[in-house]
Interface confidence: low
């Protein structure tokens, strides 16, 4: 092992006189530390400030050999390490480990020698531990980060952390002495101990490192601090909000509308040691698509990559932009997609017979599940009802029929929006399509739709204006097709009907004769049925017109 030069080489000399203390120069070796690293290995390491080129370091170790204690004559050994700032040696190298040894470093640069402070050390019990070498498990709760790792020995070490953020320098924190927790935290490591550390979580990404120091039973340090562990990189506690734009096209012929996402997900600033290293960054951005319509279906949601083009039905959806980090998923943007408004309403194929009401629509491919959703359009708008329909056998007429008792739900006299959705895979919210969507007036539409408060006003010599309050059916888009105004002379000599568009509630009747008693009635018609006539209103030109 011994020779004249090269890393790790050593030489032994008698100590005559060596200068004490430091050279006083700001350049040169400093922070010398010597310690035990394993059963047989010892190490000295130091820092060096100054030009690196052509520098050569020598570690000096001076001691009184155990068999020379009576003379007190010190013997010195030196190790030349070249440009390296670490020297490792064994007991076989002749350095006593059970008695005091004085160490210092001389750094030679050309004809100049710089010297470190001298340290005195009993090496045997001064052990440098390792930092956590394996996986450091990180969890987050209540604005705190917790780190756990396994150690196979040296339970009871003192532990420190240091952390920095993209805009801050390192700050040091104390994890406190570790008590023996009995077993490892990371699963399948028999006989290992665990250590842990708490530090604050922040709204910026953090780089954290751990170091450990052996602690004697007295509480005093039993060695120098270990090196710092590999960086642990953690994302901010609260991630920045995304600003994604969602662009929706109208429903196409297939009953689906295309949704495009535009914009960048926010980029996280990370500390220097976390660049290119996992942990602090968002692993991926996702969109959670949740279909809010058809609640009778177990709530359907699906996660897709951000930016994926989606084809959705005309139903109501919630879209949450998620950021996936080492701690799980966080919502960084929410967007609500309302149900598509109906621009055109088509008549539903609804028939009433006895106390049953039936509805029919064109069947899609075999194996399709349908969802029929109805929603009161005015008073109880959030009382949405739905039913899932899975046709058991194919109808030869390629129609799906759904029947219900005319008593409850859909038979109160009010307007409902009815939508039928279809899917071959009902658990996937992105595979539904709108089959049809329209409005339906429940109950007896003929009776409920009868116009009220019909009034007649004289206009000119042979004409009158008839006005009425809008039919209840007019609140239900597309249900009311027309009003019919009927006027007849009581002597039976004349009668006529006027057709009025559903948006109007007034008509002028002309060509009437004086001194004749007339009666006028109004009805509201749907596409399916003519309405019931209103109560007759009588008038003539001789009498006061009311």
């Amino acid at each position: 092992q011994l020779g004249a030069s090269g890393p790790g080489d050593g030489c032994c000399v008698e100590k005559t006189s060596f200068p004490e203390g430091a050279s006083g120069s700001p350049l040169g070796p400093r922070n010398l530390s010597c310690y035990r690293v394993s059963k047989t290995d010892y190490e000295c390491s130091w820092q060096y400030d100054g030009p690196e080129d052509n520098v050569s370091h020598v570690l000096w170790c001076c001691f009184v050999p155990p068999n020379h204690t009576h003379t007190g004559q010190e013997r010195c050994r030196y190790f030349s390490s070249g440009p390296d700032r670490t020297v490792q040696f064994w007991e076989q190298d002749g350095i006593p480990v059970l008695s005091k040894v004085n160490f210092w470093v001389e750094s030679r640069l050309g004809n100049r020698t710089m010297k470190s402070q001298k340290i005195s050390q009993y090496l045997y019990n001064w052990t440098k531990t390792t930092p956590p070498l394996g996986h450091i498990k990180v969890s987050q709760s209540h604005r705190q980060l917790r780190m756990d790792w396994n150690v196979s020995e040296e339970a009871g070490a003192e532990v420190q952390f240091r952390r920095r953020m993209p805009t801050t320098n390192w700050t040091l924190g104390d994890c406190g002495p570790q008590v023996n927790s009995g077993s490892g935290v990371l699963g399948d490591i028999r006989g290992s101990m665990s250590e842990s550390c708490l530090c604050p979580s922040e709204n910026m990404a953090q780089e954290i490192q751990i170091r450990r120091r052996r602690r004697l039973s007295s509480g005093a340090p039993g060695g120098p601090w270990s090196d710092w562990s590999m960086p642990v990189c953690v994302p901010p506690e609260v991630l920045p909000q995304a600003k994604i734009k969602f662009l929706v096209e109208p429903l196409n012929q297939g009953g689906r509308r295309r949704l495009t996402m535009q914009g960048q997900s926010p980029q996280l600033a990370v500390p220097e040691g976390c660049r290119g290293r996992p942990g602090a960054q968002v692993k991926k951005h996702l969109v959670l698509v949740r279909m809010l319509s058809c609640r009778c279906q177990a709530q359907t949601s699906k996660t897709v990559p951000l930016g994926k083009k989606l084809n959705l039905s005309g139903a109501t959806y919630d879209l949450n932009v998620l950021a996936k980090t080492r701690f799980g998923r966080s919502t960084i943007q929410k967007w609500h997609l309302p149900a598509q408004e109906l621009t055109e309403t088509r008549a539903l194929n609804v028939s009433v017979g006895g106390n049953m009401t039936s509805m029919q629509w064109a069947a899609q491919a075999p194996g399709t599940t349908y969802c029929l959703e109805w929603q009161p359009w005015f008073q109880h708008r959030n009382h949405t009802h739905c039913t899932l329909i899975v046709p058991e056998e194919e109808d030869p007429a390629k129609m799906v029929t759904h029947s219900w008792s005319s008593k409850p739900t859909l038979e109160q006299e009010e307007c409902y929006r009815i939508t039928v959705f279809a899917s071959k895979n009902p658990k996937n919210p992105m595979l539904w399509a709108t089959v049809l969507s329209s409005y339906y007036f429940g109950g007896n539409a003929s009776r409920a739709g009868t116009p009220r408060h019909v009034s007649v006003r004289n206009q000119t010599g042979d004409s009158v204006s008839v006005e009425w309050t809008a039919s209840q059916l007019s609140t239900c888009p597309g249900v009311l097709t027309q009003y019919v105004v009927r006027c007849e002379a009581e002597d039976g000599a004349w009668e006529s009907e006027w057709l009025v568009p559903p948006t109007k509630t007034q008509v002028t009747l002309d060509g009437l004769r004086s001194r004749v008693m007339y009666k006028v009635q109004v009805r509201a018609d749907t596409a399916r049925l003519p309405g019931a006539w209103s109560h007759p209103q009588r008038f003539s030109f001789e009498v006061q017109i009311s």
């Epitope: 070498l133 394996g134 196979s152 590999m230």
Partner: nanobody, 127 residues
Framework: QVQLQESGGGSVQAGGSLRLSCAAS????????MAWFRQAPGKEREGVAA????????YYFYSVKGRFTISQDNDENMLYLQMNSLKPEDTAMYYC????????????????????WGQGTQVTVSS
């Protein structure tokens, strides 16, 4: 049975380079220590470098620090030792070794900790 197979040894002039490879089969590769040891004729087996496969943490024995680099390829279950600035005293049989324990501490430097050993590959450095 776990098998470790070294390759890449050979003869080289002082100052030259070699790259040793070790293929690990039927070995739980992740979260373990693997190491390179060497044994020169008439001498004891000594450590060269060790690595924690969980995160790539490397440890070098003082005689090779700054000249040798240990690395891994987790996907291929391979361990490598890049040896630069070779010296005649680096001449030895080089062995790949793997620990059975799932985690370790500084005892990664002791050959008694390693259960699985390869057959070795010879490196000869002439001046």
């Amino acid at each position: 049975q776990v098998q470790l197979q070294e390759s890449g040894g050979g003869s080289v002039q002082a100052g030259g380079s070699l790259r040793l490879s070790c293929a690990a089969s039927r070995y739980t590769y992740t979260n373990n220590f693997m190491a390179w040891f060497r044994q020169a004729p008439g001498k004891e087996r000594e450590g060269v470098a060790a690595i924690y496969t969980g995160d790539g943490y490397a440890y070098y024995f003082y005689s090779v620090k700054g000249r040798f680099t240990i690395s891994q390829d987790n996907d291929e279950n391979m361990l490598y030792l890049q040896m630069n600035s070779l010296k005649p005293e680096d001449t030895a049989m080089y062995y790949c070794a793997a620990m059975e324990r799932r985690i370790g501490t500084r005892r990664m430097t002791e050959n008694a900790e390693y259960k699985y050993w390869g057959q070795g590959t010879q490196v000869t450095v002439s001046s």
